[in-house]
């Protein structure tokens, strides 16, 4: 988790002088509770936005937006703590809005936004906005949280972001898998425009099970430049096991931008349809 490298993060708006600070996610008001604390944020919304760095790279960011409740507690609102927690790693990053002037009621509801948390493809986050100071130990909570799922690199807008392009998102191998006679599969895919090797991983499963009955890896050496964008055809021999009939073919490239962590593409071959066996006709007619 990190912040987009913008020159200065701003939270000021007409009628409010405000600055954005790094935060340890442990605001002082936890340790030194105050008697009077503001109410919780209202209408917290998290959306996927995209932003360029100063270097011109494009990153997905969490666009966080919330409003204030129209009660007198805004007189005691000193700022907000924004926290983003990546759920699979428990990594957390926080920033603090520090209000340098007192809020006053005005004709419009106060609205705040922040769009500088860089998020990763195919990851889930919990976003929390805490109004400051935080409540006393038995006080009503004054935060709001929402989960936010970032699409993977198949998503049209995500595909052209720097992290997705670095992991090979622009490569479309257009995999085809064909079942041949004598327990073989023919795999065909389009090579990318880089002289790098590929792995084909074949995993076979019984019809209705998820525990594999066969696994095979085939290595494809780096193509020559004249082979870039050409189709590569590979014939894989299957293990002749009864019922080991559902095959998943994964292709893993080793592009220089992502090495061992490039996006894999896969295709699946289902077990052949079993013809419905007609009810056997009895060779005698029961009498009853």
């Amino acid at each position: 988790l990190r912040l987009l490298d913008h020159r200065a993060l701003v939270c000021s708006q007409p009628g409010l002088n405000c600055t954005v600070k790094n935060s340890t996610c442990l605001d002082d008001s936890w340790i030194h509770p105050r008697n009077l604390t503001p109410s919780s944020p209202k209408d917290l919304q998290i959306q996927l936005h995209f932003a360029h760095t100063q270097q011109g790279d494009l990153f997905p960011v969490a666009h966080i937006e919330w409003t204030l409740q129209t009660d007198a507690s805004i007189l005691y609102l000193e700022g907000a703590e924004l926290s983003v927690l990546q759920l699979n790693t428990n990594e957390r990053l926080c920033v603090r809005f520090e209000f340098l002037s007192k809020l006053r009621h005005h004709h419009r509801r106060w609205r705040f936004t922040f769009s500088h948390f860089v998020v990763d493809p195919d990851q889930e986050y919990e976003v929390t906005v805490h109004h400051l100071p935080k409540p006393i130990p038995d006080g009503d909570p004054n935060h709001q949280s929402k989960n936010f799922l970032v699409p993977d690199c198949e998503h049209a807008r995500m595909k052209v972001t720097t992290p997705c392009m670095s992991s090979g998102s622009l490569w479309d191998p257009n995999i085809t898998v064909e079942t041949l006679e004598a327990h073989q599969l023919r795999v065909s895919f389009t090579l990318w425009n880089e002289s790098t090797h590929y792995q084909i991983l074949l995993t076979s499963f019984p019809h209705m099970e998820n525990h594999s009955c066969f696994e095979h890896m085939h290595h494809i050496p780096a193509p020559r430049p004249e082979e870039f964008h050409q189709r590569s055809n590979v014939t894989l021999t299957l293990r002749n096991l009864k019922g080991c009939c559902r095959h998943q073919v994964q292709i893993q490239p080793f592009f220089s931008s992502c090495l061992n962590d490039c996006l894999r593409h896969s295709a699946t071959v289902s077990c052949p349809e079993m013809p419905d066996t007609p009810e056997p006709i009895p060779d005698y007619m029961p009498l009853w």
Epitope: L201, T203, F214, E215, H216, M217, Q252
Partner: nanobody, 113 residues
């Protein structure tokens, strides 16, 4: 924690032999195809050999007849027997389980007189 650990590397004279081992923790190695790669200093990682769950093996052309990949499912280990070593075989030898995209740290093989 899921990890691969290679061992058995060392300094050997040309024509010598070594037996490299790859052991896994956190996964059942016998359920997976396993590959060996090697990487010489300043070079790309190169494929060496692979063994599938049925025990079928494949080798890169330069090691055919000299290297043998095998597996002991009871011990949960995959071996690479390297014979008739040449100076150009000097590299870090790395074990790989493709289905988990799992890579070991490697074991150094140096062939020098």
């Amino acid at each position: 924690e899921v990890q691969l650990v290679e061992s058995g590397g060392g300094l050997v004279q040309p024509g010598g032999s070594l037996r490299l081992s790859c052991a896994a923790s956190g996964i059942i190695l016998s359920d997976n195809a396993v590959a060996w790669y090697r990487q010489a200093p300043g070079k790309q990682r190169d494929f060496v050999a692979t063994i599938n769950t049925a025990g079928w093996t494949t080798y890169t052309e330069s090691v055919k007849g000299r290297f043998t990949i095998s597996r002991d499912n009871a011990k949960g280990t995959v071996y690479l027997q390297v014979n008739r070593l040449k100076p150009e075989d000097t590299a870090v030898y790395i074990c790989n389980v493709p289905s988990y995209n799992l890579w070991g740290q490697g074991t150094q093989v140096t062939v020098s007189s």
